[in-house]
């Protein structure tokens, strides 16, 4: 019983370097505690961007120094990644783990390609 995780294929960060996307999972069971991890894949290397464990119906709580924020609604998680720069352009994978009650399930999305364009510096203006 594989758990399916869906996320958009492409997202463009805004001019402030913020990107948002929805991670939706088809829960095979009635999970009450869920862990969501955002992973970045580049050159076959995978690194953790941020992670949060939450109780169904409650808010996601990321660490204070996390670049991620999020909200949950049913089997959907709305994720926002802040402080992105052009060099952070890449594939961001949503991983969902149903931690409790048993059995444990893990689901991995296909990834969202986030494009980040650094804003042009404002030219000096002559007054």
């Amino acid at each position: 019983k594989a758990m399916h995780v869906a996320q958009p294929a492409v997202v463009l960060a805004n001019s402030r370097g913020t990107a948002s996307f929805v991670c939706e999972y088809a829960s095979p069971g009635k999970a009450t505690e869920v862990r969501v991890t955002v992973l970045r894949q580049a050159d076959s290397q995978v690194t953790e961007v941020c992670a949060a464990t939450y109780m169904m119906g409650n808010e996601l709580t990321f660490l204070d120094d996390s670049i991620c924020t999020g909200t949950s609604s049913g089997n959907q998680v709305n994720l926002t990644i802040q402080g992105l720069r052009a060099m952070d352009t890449g594939l961001y994978i949503c991983k969902v783990e149903l931690m409790y009650p048993p059995p444990y399930y893990m689901g991995i999305g296909n990834g969202t390609q986030i494009y980040v364009i650094d804003p042009e510096p404002c030219p000096d203006s002559d007054f």
């Epitope: 594989a2 953790e48 444990y104």
Partner: antibody, heavy 118, light 108 residues
Framework: EVQLVQSGAEVKKPGATVKISCKVS????????MHWIRQSPSRGLEWLGF????????YYADSVKGRFTISRDNAKNSLYLQMNSLRAEDTAVYYC???????????WGQGTLVTVSS | EIVMTQSPATLSVSPGERATLSCRAS???????LAWYQQKPGKAPKLLIY???SRATGVPSRFSGSGSGTDFTLTISSLQPEDFATYYC?????????FGQGTKVEIK
Amino acid sequence: EVQLVQSGAEVKKPGATVKISCKVSGFTFSHYTMHWIRQSPSRGLEWLGFISYDGNYKYYADSVKGRFTISRDNAKNSLYLQMNSLRAEDTAVYYCARTGWLGPFDYWGQGTLVTVSS
Amino acid sequence: EIVMTQSPATLSVSPGERATLSCRASQSVGSSYLAWYQQKPGKAPKLLIYGAFSRATGVPSRFSGSGSGTDFTLTISSLQPEDFATYYCQQDGSSPWTFGQGTKVEIK
């Protein structure tokens, strides 16, 4: 370099208790879920249980539930498996393994042979 | 519990030849949750393939994985002397994690 170094071989009598360990280095231990797996000629590779990154969640195979306990000490970068009420059929090589970000066991310890014999 | 069944139990192949190993799951596991490991005598298993077809870091391109749902295949395109070993498939999408019984690839 990622390394998982396990404690040495153990010989125990049926009914005894043993605790084996797995000391890790080369990665941030507190970010990873860890597993114990055993291997014997009769049972092949058998998953025993896992413990979440923070130790809050533990799952066990039905075959060892109630007898085996997994724990971790993130400050010491160490994972443990305590086995109680040992039986002859628990004789096996025991491996610790790390869960990679995308699911499979990407790094394994060298194995600890536990022999249960009267 | 998802039961993983591998075939054949033993495969006799000459160096340089192609080897095809099969793994069948008792229920769908999804391609993202199927891994292959190589094990040599006295050593721990080593991850070869994850997500059914992605090679782990440092794994030679002669190893390839395919399949989805319940049927998966590991192919070694041209067997090298160091490839003679036992290979295991495993599902990692739900507890309990389960392994196949292994396919031993031996020199013909």
